[in-house]
Structures are given as C-alpha cells and as structure tokens.
Amino acid sequence: QFLKEGQLAAGTCEVIAAHRDSSQPRRTIARQTARCACRKGQIAGTTRARPACVDARIIKTKQWCDMLPCLEGEGCDLLINRSGWTCTQPGGRIKTTTVS
C-alpha cells in the first residue's frame, strides 16, 4: 500500500500554516492550520500539542482534555463554558487554547 505524493496516511495530520503574533505584552497568540486524514468516527483535534485525529465524541461533548492536548507533565483544565482548555506547566505557566 503506497501513498501518492501529498497523500496522508489514515489517522495522521500535518501542519500546513502557522502564525504567531507577539505584539501584545506578555501574550503570544499562535494560530495553526492543519490538514488531517481522519478515519471514520474521528475528527481533527490536538494531542500532545500537535494536530491529531481524535475520537469525534470528544469534540461533540467538548471534553477537550480527553484529546490529551497538553504535553506530558502538564495539567489540562477546561475553560468556563467548555470554550477551550488550559495547559499548566509544572512551573505554573499557563497556556490557553480557545476553540473557534
């Protein structure tokens, strides 16, 4: 089973665009666009801070931490109204992701 050029293996993703805005003090806004080839029952999400195919139920229920979106050793918490999640590093630094 060979993949054509540009074709993704089932269940995998690739980043196709990334943008960082550091114009605001003490705040960096990062946006990322990914292309995913998800299997039936999966949808594009984030695992270990990278684009990944995740169980579609996670997206439907907005249980974002079930994607395991944070790096190993970080703590994941849902934002109010389940509008996204935070990843808290051992040192206390917090990274917030909002879903749009």
Epitope: T12, C13, R39, R48, A52, T61, D66, L68, E72, C76
Partner: antibody, heavy 120, light 107 residues
Framework: QVQLQESGPGLVKPSETLSLTCTVS????????WSWIRQPPGKGLEWIGY???????NYNPSLKSRVTISVDTSKNQFSLNLKSVTAVDTAVYYC??????????????WGQGTTVTVSS | DIQMTQSPSSLSASVGDRITISCRAS??????LNWYQQTPGKAPRLLIY???TLQSGVPSRFSGGGSGTDFSLTITSLQPEDFATYYC?????????FGQGTKLDIK
C-alpha cells in the same frame, strides 16, 4: 517511573460481579488513557476497554453489556467491574497505560497482572 | 471488528538465528500496529508501535515493517531472552484486537 498495580479478589463466584482496581503511581492519571486487558489460562490477550481522563469510555462490544470502567483522579486509580461472571471470565487481568505516540496509541506500561478465578 | 491473524502460531529457532513473524489485518489499518513480547508469568511488553518505531529501551535487533494489511516483526541474532510469545495488536479501531500470538521456542 510510572507503575501500575492491580488489586482485587482472586476468587469470584458465578453470577457475581468481578471488581478490580488499578493504582497508578509515579505519574498523573489525567495525562493518558487507561485500559484493561485480560488473558484466559493458556490463551491470548483480549482488550476489555479504555477510559479517558473525563471518565468517558470505550468498551469491547463482546463485553459491553457487562463491563464498567471508572476513574477516580483524586486517588490516581481506575477500576473494572464485570458483572454476571461465568467460568469463561477466569483469566489474568492486566491494567495498562495507553500512550499516544504521535498518532499511534499503544499500551506502554502494564501492571503485573492479577489472576481471577470464577468458581463456586 | 478487525481480525488480526499471525503466522506461524509457533516457531523453533536457535540463538543467533534471524526470524520473522507475520501479522495480517482483515482490513487496512495503515500503520496503526503494535507488537508486544510476553514471557511466561509476566505482563506483555511493548516492543514496536506505529508498525516500525522501536519503543525506548528495546534492543535494535528488533524491527517492524509493513502497512495496510500486511506486517512483520523481525529479530536478528536471537538472544536467549527473546524466546517468548509475540502478539500484534491494531490501534485503528474499536475494539482493539490482538493477534492470537506466536510462540518462539528454542530448537
């Protein structure tokens, strides 16, 4: 170094409920998925199910009507309940950590296993 | 459910030999395949994930390959501690299914 330890009764009577607990030490239960697997005497491995940090689950359809997996993050434990057991449920039961290696979910840390015999 | 079929079911070999175990999925699973080693009385140990990536701490004499429906595990220069039962497992669908196992023993 993450370690898993299964605990629970080694003997269960037919028609009763098998209850096992897996205690996770050396790491947070919230950062992974967790799984139960069993192995009948002299046979191969059978996947029972997963649990996610939120408590959401995926079960093997062959056992779905009888199985419940739950998580207690405050105790760093997850549990297996299998109701209405019969002799065919006699097996070594393993708990395992499910690691998302990029896109490839694999069970990379296992408990040592606990033998459960179903007999009157 | 996806069925996983291993061959052979048992295999006899000698220390220093090179052996290959095959695993076939009943439908395409891309490279979502793991290999485990189990010695008697012990829990399984992850050897390879993603069909070909060696798990940390696993000796380089182990290698995996394949994609789609056909996969293989190769051990070059067998060591005494390699005589065990080997299982493949797919991670593409629910339920996760294992192959029936391949028992490798000393000739």
């Amino acid at each position: 170094q993450v370690q898993l330890q299964e605990s629970g009764p080694g003997l269960v009577k037919p028609s009763e409920t098998l209850s096992l607990t897996c205690t996770v030490s050396g790491g947070s239960i919230s950062s992974y998925y967790w799984s139960w697997i069993r192995q009948p005497p002299g046979k191969g491995l059978e996947w029972i199910g997963y649990i996610y940090p939120s408590g959401s689950t995926n079960y093997n359809p062959s056992l779905k009507s009888r199985v419940t997996i739950s998580v207690d993050t405050s105790k760093n434990q997850f549990s297996l309940n299998l109701k209405s057991v019969t002799a065919v449920d006699t097996a070594v039961y393993y708990c395992a950590r499910v690691n998302p290696f990029g896109y490839y979910y694999a069970m990379d840390v296992w408990g040592q296993g606990t033998t459960v015999t179903v007999s009157s | 459910d996806i069925q996983m079929t291993q061959s052979p079911s048992s295999l006899s070999a000698s220390v220093g030999d090179r052996i290959t175990i095959s695993c076939r999925a009943s439908q395409s699973i891309s490279t979502s395949l793991n290999w485990y080693q189990q010695t008697p009385g012990k829990a399984p140990r992850l050897l390879i994930y993603g069909a070909s990536t060696l798990q940390s701490g696993v000796p380089s004499r182990f290698s995996g390959g394949g994609s789609g429906t056909d996969f293989s595990l190769t051990i070059t220069s067998l060591q005494p501690e390699d005589f065990a039962t080997y299982y493949c497992q797919e991670s593409a669908s629910i339920p996760r299914t294992f192959g029936q196992g391949t028992k490798l023993d000393i000739k």
